[in-house]
């Protein structure tokens, strides 16, 4: 049975040209995390795999940095980066957990709340996502909570 819950940074805003940290945390389960996917709508941004470490999608290499931990840092933000982001935790034996973050990139300093949301993780609750998301075949050691390259 899936007992875990995903906490995320929730709905966040940031200024155009700035950077933002997307964070998720899986708790209340002893399941081993074999891979974490970061996805934006229908695009794969990055993966942190227990065996293979971090891999960033080539089209995002210039603007996406791994971490901190299992999070993802988006840099040089544009208004087009506004939208939904998903962290997909592939775990064994539980299966797949998905967290959702909505990012709004604003033209000016209207993005005053961005940093505040970064300080406190927003409790999102458990969601088992049905489509398009993937567990990796081959993660044996599991990912540490802090993540990073292995």
């Amino acid at each position: 049975m899936m007992t875990g819950t995903i906490e995320t940074t929730g709905n966040i805003s940031a200024e155009k040209g700035g950077s933002i940290i997307l964070q998720c945390h899986l708790s209340s389960t002893t399941a081993q995390v074999t891979q974490v996917n970061w996805e934006q709508q229908d695009q794969l941004l990055a993966i942190c795999n227990a065996d293979l470490g971090w891999h960033i999608s080539p089209s995002f290499k210039d603007r996406v940095a791994p971490g901190p931990g299992l999070g993802l840092t988006l840099q040089s933000l544009t208004v087009n980066d506004t939208g939904e982001y998903f962290c997909i935790y592939h775990t064994y034996p539980d299966g797949t957990y998905t967290g959702r973050i909505f990012l709004e990139v604003l033209e000016s300093s209207v993005a005053e709340h961005g940093a505040r949301f970064q300080e406190n993780l927003y409790f999102q609750g458990l969601e088992h996502h049905h489509h398009h998301h993937h567990h990796h075949h081959g993660g044996s050691g599991g990912l540490p909570e802090t993540g990073g390259d292995r």
Partner: antibody, heavy 122, light 111 residues
Framework: EVQLVQSGAEVKKPGSSVKVSCKAS????????ISWVRQAPGQGLEWMGG????????DVAEKFQGRVTITADKSTSTAYIELSSLRSEDTAVYYC???????????????WGRGTLVTVSS | QSALTQPRSVSGSPGQSVTISCTGT?????????RSWYQQHPGKAPKLMIY???YRPSGVSNRFSGSKSGNTASLTISGLQAEDEADYYC??????????FGAGTKLTVLG
Amino acid sequence: EVQLVQSGAEVKKPGSSVKVSCKASGYTFASYGISWVRQAPGQGLEWMGGITPFFNRVDVAEKFQGRVTITADKSTSTAYIELSSLRSEDTAVYYCARDLRRGGVGDAFDIWGRGTLVTVSS
Amino acid sequence: QSALTQPRSVSGSPGQSVTISCTGTSPDVGSHAYRSWYQQHPGKAPKLMIYEVSYRPSGVSNRFSGSKSGNTASLTISGLQAEDEADYYCSSYPPSSATVFGAGTKLTVLG
């Protein structure tokens, strides 16, 4: 439309090799793993291995290690399997299948090619 | 011999329900969530019906449902129809282990 188009049927001699291709379209090829599954006449499904273009990672089932080479060409969105030292028991339909979700090999498979019949006969 | 055991055949009449079981016989394919079911008609490629034990891909009829208890996963087909007659394969795909298929179950729709 998401689809996988496989190369045509092959007839091979024992001891030779065969290379089957699987061209993907309708999605971002590099983001999804592609696996190869075969089915001998009247038999069940057998997973042979797969490739994750995103990682350039290849997994091959223990039974086929040393005889199977799985590759992918991202520029043409095509995956390949090559099976060497063919024997009569390798006669089968070879399917390529796409992972349901992004990022790895060995998931449930939601998109399948139509299959390529490989006949090994002297 | 597969590490997943399925009955060779099952049958039912139109409108009835049938259940196909799939038992993991090794630790690698034990009581984890990574189980799926495929339907295959003669001469056709397999079709994914259920994944991660109980989730249906879009486009699959809600007459198909999956469940699991311990090492045994089950596929239940309710309101049986003639077009359901096919072979059904369960699959296990745990991390750090090969994908494994069961030997398949032939479903016959009677009458």
